[in-house]
């Protein structure tokens, strides 16, 4: 299996609300296959924000075309942010397995969220 | 429902070109990696191209490269294969097929029929 | 190379198990497809493994181990008989390849 790591270069990133974030994440290798996901928290009730498989989720935009075959940007954008949404997300690698199996996660980028300027 | 509508096929000399086409409905097209795939009479199947979701990105088995061209119009929700130098091997079914996340095929068109002889 | 038996033939309501073997595990997903006669279009009966369409059967089932994937039709029926193919795409070379297909007939 190849040494495969999840990069997540901000450790914060800083949006007013109303807008959109952008929440960077490359991994170094598409081996060994497997889905990425996105994460906000951690443990047992972290909140799922994007699944690369599957799964509707209206506000989050994969940055790269992630039909790509050697897509490695697994970077996501947010719309309309409000208060709510901050927090620190995580980009996940899985292997494939019944079910998936997690492999590495990045740092994670801390989301705050700015009042909207008046 | 999903559908795929392959188009094009015909008797051709050897040496000559053909253009085959598949209209696709009932997805949103533009957000799919499309593939072609093969079959010649008795034989199994065999992948030929794929293209990403938005048209930039391209992969091609090594005995089509350079004679055959994947490409697609996503305004027109359709998809072609432009096929050039043909020969008697590529004498074939030819069906369009949509790509799953991880670019296996979840729904395959008809079929066009592809004739090369003299 | 995807290597899978040219043939296999069961009883109706018997078990069914077609093996696909040649992939990578760590670098490969499978799907198998089902074509009813020779040219007519193929129909995903599984993707990404294990995973069956909405509008297939729960009969069949899919798995992978090692360098190899199985497809398993638990109590088969006469509609079943068909030609399978396996598949799978190599996400270090980003190629596609397929078997040499499976004729499965019910007695």
């Known amino acids: 299996e190849e040494e495969l790591q999840v990069i997540q270069p901000e450790k914060s990133v800083s949006v007013a609300a109303g807008e959109s974030a952008t929440l960077n994440c490359t991994a170094t290798s598409l081996i060994p296959v497997g889905p990425i996901q996105w994460f906000r928290g951690v443990g047992p009730g972290r909140e799922l924000i994007y699944h690369q498989k599957e799964g509707h989720f209206p506000r989050v935009t994969p940055v790269s075309d992630p039909t790509k075959r050697n897509n490695m940007d697994f970077s996501i954008r947010i719309s309309n942010i409000t208060p709510a949404d901050a927090g620190t997300y995580y980009c996940v690698k899985f292997r494939k397995g019944s079910p998936d199996v997690e492999l590495k996660s990045g740092a994670g980028t801390e989301l705050s969220v700015r009042a909207k300027p008046s | 429902d999903v559908q795929l509508v392959d188009s094009g096929g015909g008797v051709v000399r050897p040496g000559e070109s053909l253009r085959l086409s598949c209209a696709a409905s009932?997805?949103?097209?533009?957000?799919?990696?499309m593939s072609w795939v093969r079959q010649a009479p008795g034989k199994g199947l065999e992948w030929l191209a794929g293209i990403s979701a938005g048209g930039s990105d391209t992969y091609y088995i090594d005995s089509v490269k350079g004679r055959f061209t994947i490409s697609r119009d996503n305004s027109k929700n359709s998809l072609y294969l432009q096929m050039n130098s043909l020969t008697a091997e590529d004498t074939a079914v030819y069906y369009c097929?949509?790509?799953?996340?991880?670019?296996?095929?979840?729904?395959w068109g008809l079929g066009t029929l592809v004739t090369v002889s003299s | 190379a995807l290597t899978q038996p040219a043939s296999v033939s069961a009883n109706p309501g018997e078990t069914v198990k077609i093996t696909c073997s040649g992939g990578d595990y760590y670098s490969t997903y499978y799907g198998w497809y089902q074509q009813k006669s020779p040219g007519s279009a193929p129909v995903t009966v599984i993707h990404s493994d294990d995973k069956r369409p909405s509008d297939i059967p729960s009969r069949f089932s899919g798995s992978a181990s090692g360098s190899a994937a199985t497809l398993t039709i638990t109590g088969v029926r006469v509609e079943d008989e068909a030609v399978y193919f396996c598949?799978?795409?190599?996400?270090?070379?980003?190629?596609?390849?397929f078997g040499a297909g499976t004729t499965l007939t019910v007695l």
């Open positions: 097929a949509r790509e799953t996340w991880n670019h296996l095929f979840d729904y």
């Open positions: 009932g997805f949103t097209f533009s957000s799919y990696a």
């Open positions: 598949g799978a795409y190599d996400g270090r070379t980003y190629i596609n390849t």
